[in-house]
Amino acid sequence: PRSIDVKYIGVKSAYVSYDVQKRTIYLNITNTLNITNNNYYSVEVENITAQVQFAKTVIGKARLNNITHIGPLDMKQIDYTVPTVIAEEMSYMYDFCTLISIKVHNIVLMMQVTVTTTYFGHSEQISQERYQYVDCGRNTTYQLGQSEYLNVLQPQQ
C-alpha cells in the first residue's frame, strides 16, 4: 500500500463569544485538512479526533465519525470545528481578549489532529500538530495559512 497523506492547512475561521458573568471566552475554531489517497483503491476516513491546547492546557476537543471516502489517487479537503473554552484558571485571558485598546488579540494555540483511515479492514492513524495564531477579540475568517505560527517562535517541547 502507498501512503495516505494528511496535511493540516490551517485555521479557516474563529468565532468568539463571551460570558461576562463567568469571564469566559468561547472560541469556535474551524480548521482545514487535506487528505490525499495515493493508493489505487478507495479508503474510508473513519474518524477525525482533534484537540486544541492553550498554554499546555487542553481547552477543546472534537471527534467526527464516518466522514467520507476518498477514491483512488484522490484528495479531499475536510473542515472540522473544535469548540474551545478559555475559563477558570485562564480567565486572566478574558482581560486581554476584551481590551478594546488592542485591535488584534492574537493568542497561540496548539492544534492537534489525528485522522483514522481504513482500507480492506486495515486501520491507520496519522497525526499532525501545529501552532496557530487565533484572534480571541473578534470573529475572524482567515486566508488559508494566514494564521500560522512560525516554527522559530515555538516554545520548547
Epitope: 461576562v20 469571564r23 486572566y92 478574558y94 482581560d95 476584551t98 481590551l99 478594546i100 485591535k103 473578534r138
Partner: antibody, heavy 119, light 111 residues
Amino acid sequence: EVQLVESGGDLVKPGGSLRLSCAASGFTFSGYGMSWIRQTPDKRLEWVATISSGGRYTVYPDSVKGRFTMSRDNVKNTLYLQMSSLKSEDTALYYCARDNFYSYAMDYWGLGTSVTVSA
Amino acid sequence: DIVMTQAAFSNPVTLGTSASISCRSSKSLLHSNGITYLFWYLQKPGQSPQLLIYQMSNLASGVPDRFSSSGSGTDFTLRISRVEAEDVGVYYCAQNLELWTFGGGTKLEIK
C-alpha cells in the same frame, strides 16, 4: 439599566492630589473594561485612561502618564482615578465610561464630576 | 497622535430636512483587519456624550435610522435624514485605531 455615577470632584491647588470614584450598576461590572474621559472648559473631549475588565491592564495618554493611576474594585463595582501632581490644564469635567468589546466603543457614559485646579 | 478635525458649526438646517457633519482624520482609520475605527457621539445640552455610530457605519443601540455614516479611511460624514428638534447638540467624531482622540465637535444649528 446601565448607570455610572462619578464622585470626588473638587477644587484643588496645583501640585495637589484627588481621587475620583465611579459607581457602576445595571451590568456585570467585572466583565467590561472601563475608561475615564474628561471635557475641558472649552468643551473638548480628552481620553484619560482605560483599564481592562479584571484590572490587569491599564493604558494612559502621555499627558497623564506617571501622574494618574486608574484602578477598580470588582467586588464593590467601583472604578477609581487617582490624580496627583495636578496642573491647571487638568481642570475638566471627568466622565467614566464603559468599554464595549463588540463595538469597540465607549457605549455608556456617566454624568461626570467636576475637577478644578487653581491656586 | 491621530488628529481629528471638525468644523465648529454646521450649516444651519431646517427641521425636517437633512444635515451633514464632516470629520477628517490625520491618518487612515482603516485597520488591516478591515474595520474602520471611527465613532460618532452626540452631546445634547446639559447631558453627557452618547454613542451614535461605531466602526464608521454601524448604528448604536436605540439610535434612530435617520442617522447614517459613511467615509473613506480619512474623510467621514454623518448624515441626519430628517432633522428633529431633539437632534440639537454637539457632534463629536472620535477614533481609537490608536489611543482615543476626539474631534473638537460640530454644533448642529437649526434655522
